[in-house]
């Protein structure tokens, strides 16, 4: 599974959108979790409403908000007031009983504010050439990179 790299500015909000097959995942709740360590578990941060039909309602845990558009097949997670400690590897998951299927791996990087807006576009020029899309970010300079983890050494 590829990992999306998203960068957001400290103090601002970062919106993550994970898409999925709406039919395949019909009736399943979604969750956002943070991976602890290379081989560690994925610690649940927040999950959608317990009643699947109400999954469109926003659920919050601290500064993280999740909502699921089950018809469009898009679960949206918003990390508000980004802090350095929010940086990490996360997963969007689809829940079925005790099983969790990974929909998307997301690497969140939290950047220092640039000196001024003029510099913002030069924060990071990726060396790898890969498919770039518009960043899924609110009020934030960011890049969105699809890439795969290299093999562990």
């Amino acid at each position: 599974l590829n990992t999306t790299v998203l960068q957001g500015m400290a103090g601002q909000s970062l919106r993550v959108s994970c898409t999925y097959d709406a039919l395949k995942h019909w009736g399943r709740r979604k969750a956002w979790c943070r991976q602890l360590g290379e081989e560690g578990p994925c610690q649940r941060v927040v999950s959608t409403h317990g009643v699947w039909l109400l999954a469109f309602l926003k659920k919050r845990n601290g500064s993280t908000v999740i909502a699921d558009d089950t018809l469009a097949g898009t679960v949206t997670i918003t990390l508000k007031n980004l802090q350095a400690g929010d940086a990490g590897l996360y997963q969007c998951q689809s829940l079925r009983g005790r099983e969790a299927e990974v929909l998307q791996k997301v690497l969140v990087e939290v950047l220092e504010d640039p000196l001024d807006d003029q510099d913002a576009g030069d924060l990071w020029v990726p060396e790898e050439s890969s498919s770039f899309e518009g960043a899924q970010v609110e009020h934030s300079t960011s890049r969105n990179q699809e890439t795969s983890f290299p093999p562990t050494s």
Epitope: V5, E109, W124, S153
Partner: antibody, heavy 121, light 107 residues
């Protein structure tokens, strides 16, 4: 064991640039941020910024923005910090340090031995 | 920027003493605080992260506590190898900042 080995001492003239290297071993290089910290003679520690070796993403303290460039070469598990437009007050020992969090910022756990950079005309 | 202050700036102690160093942040940093030990001419050594978690390989005579703005590093029984300068660092908010250091020397 986890180890960071830095390049040797440098003497530079004001206005020049210096590039310090930090070679990592004993762990998955792409899994852990590398921070750069400096210490001027007889003074305390000053954080400069970090690079995420997995993505190449960087951030730096505003004080250094526009003057510091952090890069990495994953094929040889090395990180680099280049400081340009050197001034005499950039004379310091420059350290690289690994963050202990997996692709996260949990505080540094292992430090390089330091690289002395002297800026003098 | 978050200012980190340490007290005392220096202290003299004897082998076997219990030593406490305090670190204060100018604003709340939760538990995003680390402690380091540095000896002259050497690189800093990481002792504590997340305010109270001991780094791997660090002896249990070192302990950390606190949350928010006030933190302490305690050395339960000072040994000859513990005479050094100790720094705290916050990694909650950019730029990550260090305290000015506390020098522990022999009485």
């Amino acid at each position: 064991q986890v180890q960071l080995v830095q390049s040797g001492a440098e003497v530079k003239k004001p206005g020049a640039s210096v590039k310090v290297s930090c070679k990592a071993s004993g762990y998955t290089f792409t899994g852990y941020y590398i921070h750069w910290v400096r210490q001027a003679p007889g003074l305390g520690l000053e954080w400069m910024g970090w690079i995420n070796p997995y993505s190449g993403g960087t951030t730096s303290a505003q004080k250094f923005q526009g003057r510091v460039t952090m890069t990495r070469d994953t094929s040889i598990s090395s990180a680099y910090m280049e400081l340009s437009r050197l001034r005499s007050d950039d004379t310091a020992v420059y350290y690289c340090a690994r963050d202990g969090g997996y692709l996260a910022l949990y505080g540094t756990d292992v430090w390089g031995q330091g690289t002395t950079v002297t800026v003098s005309s | 920027d978050i200012q980190m202050t340490q007290s005392p700036s220096s202290l003299s102690a004897s082998v076997g003493d219990r030593v406490t160093i305090t670190c204060r942040a100018s604003q709340g940093i939760s538990n995003y605080l680390a402690w380091f030990q540095q000896k002259p001419g050497k690189a800093p050594k990481s002792l504590i992260y997340a305010a109270s978690s001991l780094q791997s390989g660090v002896p249990s005579k070192f302990s950390g506590s606190g949350s928010g703005t006030d933190f302490t590093l305690t050395i339960s029984s000072l040994q000859p190898e513990d005479f050094a300068t100790y720094y705290c660092q916050q990694y909650s908010t950019y730029p990550f900042t260090f305290g000015p250091g506390t020098k522990v020397d022999i009485k």
